[in-house]
Interface confidence: medium
């Protein structure tokens, strides 16, 4: 029985040029995290592995920082950066977890940038 | 050339025994996850188990969590698939499998099989 | 446990035609799905991964599309050598599991 809830950053707003940092968590549940995978869309951008450590797509190479934690730091945000962002937690025995993060990025440089947390 | 290469099957009774290997070239086994799969004399393919990259997780299928135990020999860049209690309905020929990235990916390189036949 | 549910069990094409395979799963697993094309004989060998991505040295008359629970491979002009069976897996949540496999054959 799944009885992890995921708590994410929300939705979030950032500067073109800047960096923005996404974060999930999963809490309420013993299972075992075996691998975070973080999607744009449909589009998959990096992977935190438990035993492998971190994947980062080849595309997204230049721009895509692993961590802190398990987070994925975004650089060099541009307005096409803007769309749903996903934690998807594979866990053992729970199974998958799936968060979703809106981002916006802005022209204006009176972006504020959504609330952050870490991992302990 | 990246090759996996399975041995060890074989003609096995009802509640026997039998472990079958993969022998792994071309690539470091320990840099990768690892699957077995399996499949029935003209049935589909069924997947049976997986091995994280640092050998620390592992992941089975329902039909044979607590017979079977897979498990990899670095210095022999070898991955084992312990088979106990064996029924009927494990005859199939095994494969095993290289993970492409992480353990929730695509099984990208294949060995060509061996046949296990469990029958009194 | 996703169940993976293929269509059709199998099919009768000639060289040439356009083939649509399609496959169903239970639940969403978002882009988590990959094909497999199989000979008799033969082990299994992936054709594309994430549902879309075509692995290296696999020709382009193959294509996958497809998000969430419906999928589709599609073969733009089936030549000889891919009459064969061809299974979709997910990879979204373990156990990873398989469709039951749409064998084309020569009509």
């Known amino acids: 029985m799944m009885t992890g809830t995921i708590e994410t950053t929300g939705n979030i707003s950032a500067e073109k040029g800047g960096s923005i940092i996404l974060q999930c968590h999963l809490s309420s549940t013993t299972a075992q995290v075996t691998q975070v995978n973080w999607e744009q869309q449909d589009q998959l951008l990096a992977i935190c592995n438990a035993d492998l450590g971190w994947h980062i797509s080849p595309s997204f190479k230049d721009r895509v920082a692993p961590g802190p934690g398990l987070g994925l730091t975004l650089q060099s945000l541009t307005v096409n950066d803007t769309g749903e962002y996903f934690c998807i937690y594979h866990t053992y025995p729970d199974g998958t977890y799936t968060g979703r993060i809106f981002l916006e990025v802005l022209e204006s440089s009176v972006a504020e940038h959504g609330a952050r947390f870490q991992i302990p | 050339e990246v090759q996996l290469l399975e041995s060890g099957g074989g003609l096995v009774q009802p509640g026997g025994s039998l472990r079958l290997s993969c022998a792994a070239s071309?690539?470091?086994?320990?840099?990768?996850?690892m699957a077995w799969v399996r499949q029935a004399p003209g049935k589909g393919l069924e997947w049976v188990s997986t091995?994280?990259?640092?050998?620390?997780?592992?992941y089975y299928a329902d039909s044979v969590k607590g017979r079977f135990t897979i498990s990899r020999d670095n210095s022999k860049n070898t991955l084992y698939l312990q088979m106990n209690s064996l029924r009927a309905e494990d005859t199939a020929v095994y494969y095993c499998?290289?993970?492409?990235?992480?353990?929730?990916?695509?099984?990208?390189?294949w060995g060509q099989g061996t046949l296990v036949t469990v029958s009194s | 446990d996703i169940q993976m549910t293929q269509s059709p069990y199998s099919l009768s094409a000639s060289v040439g035609d356009r083939v649509t395979i399609t496959c169903r799963a239970s639940?969403?697993?978002?882009?988590?799905l990959n094909w497999y094309q199989q000979k008799p004989g033969k082990a299994p060998k992936l054709l594309i991964y994430?549902?879309?991505t075509l692995q290296t040295g696999v020709p382009s008359r193959f294509s996958g599309s497809g998000s969430g629970t419906d999928f589709t491979l599609t073969i733009s002009s089936l030549q000889p050598e891919d009459f064969a069976t061809y299974y979709c897996?997910?990879?979204?949540?373990?156990?990873?599991?398989f469709g039951g496999g749409t064998k084309v054959e020569i009509k």
């Open positions: 994430r549902a879309s």
């Open positions: 091995l994280s990259g640092s050998g620390g997780s592992t």
């Open positions: 897996q997910q990879t979204y949540s373990s156990p990873f599991t």
């Open positions: 499998a290289r993970v492409r990235v992480g353990a929730y990916d695509a099984f990208d390189i």
């Open positions: 639940q969403s697993i978002r882009r988590y």
């Open positions: 071309g690539f470091t086994l320990s840099s990768y996850a």
